[in-house]
Amino acid sequence: HNTTVFQGVEGQSLQVSCPYDSMKHWGRRKAWCRQLGEKGPCQRVVSTHNLWLLSFLRRRNGSTAITDDTLGGTLTITLRNLQPHDAGFYQCQSLHGSEADTLRKVLVEVLADPLDHRDAGDLWVPGESESFEDAHVEHSISRSLLEGEIPFPPTS
């Protein structure tokens, strides 16, 4: 699997999409996990509804939400109020019993807020109490890492 990079701005929401073959993964729940180290395990962050039929319902764990379009074959993860510590490697997974198939490997990059330390004026920033549905979702920038490419090249 190549790694797809998704970039989001600190404090805003980032939407990660993982396309998959809906027939191949029919009836299977999905999950979003965080890779702990290069060879380490992938720690489950959130998974879709226990009843596959209800996978379209948004489930959340803290600032992360997941929803699955099982007909269209797209798993969507929303990271709300993105913080620097959210940066790192993740996976979208398809679950079959105790097994987990990787649908997509993801690198989340958090960019500094360009409006930071400036007068935000009338800019609306979603409050902590507001729901995912109301949160403003930034269109994420994504690209695939080339084979052998270093995700964070050293700066000269």
Epitope: D21, M23, K24, W26, G27, W52, L53, H96, G97, E99
Partner: antibody
């Protein structure tokens, strides 16, 4: 009509190779997993493995891993089960079956081939 | 691997009898279980999927129940064509596994 039609009976000698087939019709063959099931004479059913013809993703039962090869050619809507060196203990009936798709999720094995008898004897 | 323990291995019954066959999984399989009927010389036929759902064309005298570790196939009134061998199959985890089978014979 959704159908899986298997190749005919085979009589082989130990050490010989063999490839049997299972041709799907009446549905989108690449979009459904195909399983292989063994039934030795007078015995029960044993799940050997499964393949998704769309991308040839394959899973094997540990009991059959390394003993057989499961493959598929979606261009001719056919799945295959292959032995490189047959043993007398491979004598059995072999079934292919399609994993069903139901509104509520997967539906087990909903359509079965008629079976292929393989006899291995010196 | 998940073991499926099916009981009884055989039973004798008469036409009109109520017959119950049980399958027990060695670990949780949700409702990812099907029941299959096989007659001598024929391919198996699916009778029940998702533990309790009846495919179209299967007579309503067949029913499935249970979840978690224990599942049951019931034939409410045995008919002459029901004398066969019955298998359960779990498709929750690889490798999928069948029960040992239950042969239903005429008394």
């Amino acid at each position: 009509e959704v159908q899986l039609v298997q190749s005919g009976a085979e009589v082989k000698k130990p050490g010989e190779s063999l490839k049997i087939s299972c041709k799907g019709s009446g549905y989108s063959f690449p979009s459904y997993w195909i399983a292989w099931v063994r039934q030795m004479p007078g015995k029960g059913l044993e799940w050997m493995g499964i393949i998704y013809p769309g991308d040839s993703d394959t899973r094997y039962s540990p009991s059959f891993q390394g003993q057989v090869t499961i493959s598929a050619d979606k261009s001719i809507s056919t799945a295959f089960l292959k032995w490189s060196s047959l043993k007398a203990s491979d004598t059995a009936m072999y079934f292919c079956a399609r994993q069903g798709i139901e509104v509520t999720g997967t539906g087990g094995l909903d359509v079965w081939g008629q079976g292929t008898t393989v006899t291995v004897s010196s | 691997d998940i073991q499926m323990t099916q009981s009884p291995s055989s039973l004798s019954a008469s036409v009109g009898d109520r017959v119950t066959i049980t399958c027990r999984a060695s670990q949780g399989i949700r409702n990812d279980l099907g029941w299959y009927q096989q007659k001598p010389g024929n391919a198996p036929k699916r009778l029940i999927y998702a533990a309790s759902s009846l495919p179209s064309g299967v007579p309503s005298r067949f029913s499935g129940s249970g979840s978690g570790p224990e599942f049951t196939l019931t034939i409410s009134s045995l008919q002459p064509e029901d004398f066969a061998t019955y298998y359960c199959l779990q498709h929750n985890s690889y490798p999928w596994t069948f029960g040992q089978g239950t042969k239903v014979e005429i008394t």
